[in-house]
Interface confidence: medium
């Protein structure tokens, strides 16, 4: 698997992973204790033809062009968890692994 990495200075228009730091305090999410902010990343850009398409199905659907189908979108194709310290529903503070919190790779799907 392959994905492009960009930054705020990139001129790349194709589907790319960009850095993004999420700040929970700025959201007012005080039930998250740590980390108060983390590197989440995000996907943005155009999906032309077969560029970075994760599944052959994506290309085939686009070719067949059934009614109501949209073109492929730039979306996470690989994500990873982070460890967080947070209040659970029972007012306990828990240290736990939360899945799919970080975008590791972007592609077209």
């Amino acid at each position: 698997d392959f994905g492009l990495d960009c930054d705020e200075h990139s001129t790349e228009s194709r589907c790319c992973r960009y850095p993004l730091t999420v700040d929970f305090e700025a959201f007012g999410w005080d039930w998250i204790i740590a980390p108060k902010r983390y590197k989440a990343n995000y996907c943005s850009g155009e999906c032309e033809f077969v560029f970075l398409q994760k599944y052959p199905h994506t290309h085939l659907v686009h070719q067949a062009n059934p009614r109501g189908s949209a073109g492929p979108c730039c979306t996470p194709t690989k994500m990873s968890p982070i460890n967080m310290l947070y209040f659970n529903g029972k007012e306990q503070i828990i240290y736990g692994k939360i899945p799919a919190m970080v975008v590791d790779r972007c592609g077209c799907s």
Epitope: E25, D30, I33, P35, K36, Y38, Q92, V102
Partner: antibody
Amino acid sequence: QVQLVESGPGLVKPSETLSLTCTVYGGSISSGNYYWGWIRQPPGKGLEWIGTIYYSGSAYYNPSLKSRVTMSVDTSKNQFSLKLSSVTAADTAVYYCVRDYYDSSGHYYNWFDPWGQGTTVTVSS
Amino acid sequence: AIQMTQSPSSLSASVGDRVTITCRASQDIRHDLGWYQQKPGKAPKRLIYAASSLQSGVPSRFSGSGSGTEFTLTISSLQPEDFATYYCLQHNTYPWTFGQGTKVEIK
């Protein structure tokens, strides 16, 4: 290398408020990846976590002490403080300040490292 | 609060001995456990984090194992500087709690 140094009175009278300060040297207390805490150890006994505070002022306390504990941060002095009200002889202990580190990748957390050298507080009239 | 029970509370051993200290948690804490060494008049020093990872600068004779509710600190060959009190710490659920300590003395 970050160093933590506790300061405050060594003797407090029963029913009064114990006040301690921890000064952080060699690093900024405002760094977003660090949390600051207090741990105590009564003479000849084990360790008890008192609470932890973030530089923004968010604090989390041990429920067993919560009604008596207040922690605060003074970023201008690179210090954080502990106040423990209505003390009794059972609060006689060595009080340590500590640092926690939470990596913004969310993959590596480091509890209670480093520690201050500890300061002895005796509650007695 | 999660209770951490250490055993034994004290032990006597000789230089070169293999020493094992156990820590039991009152509920599942995954791998969220550290081991600390404390010498008289000094602040504790962390030896092991995440149940089995060796702190940088700590001799390899120290090792940790376990997960869930049962954990072990092993000193493979006790050295004169290892005579101290050892504490486990759970950091799975607030409040963080320590074991009551194991004092390792010279036989």
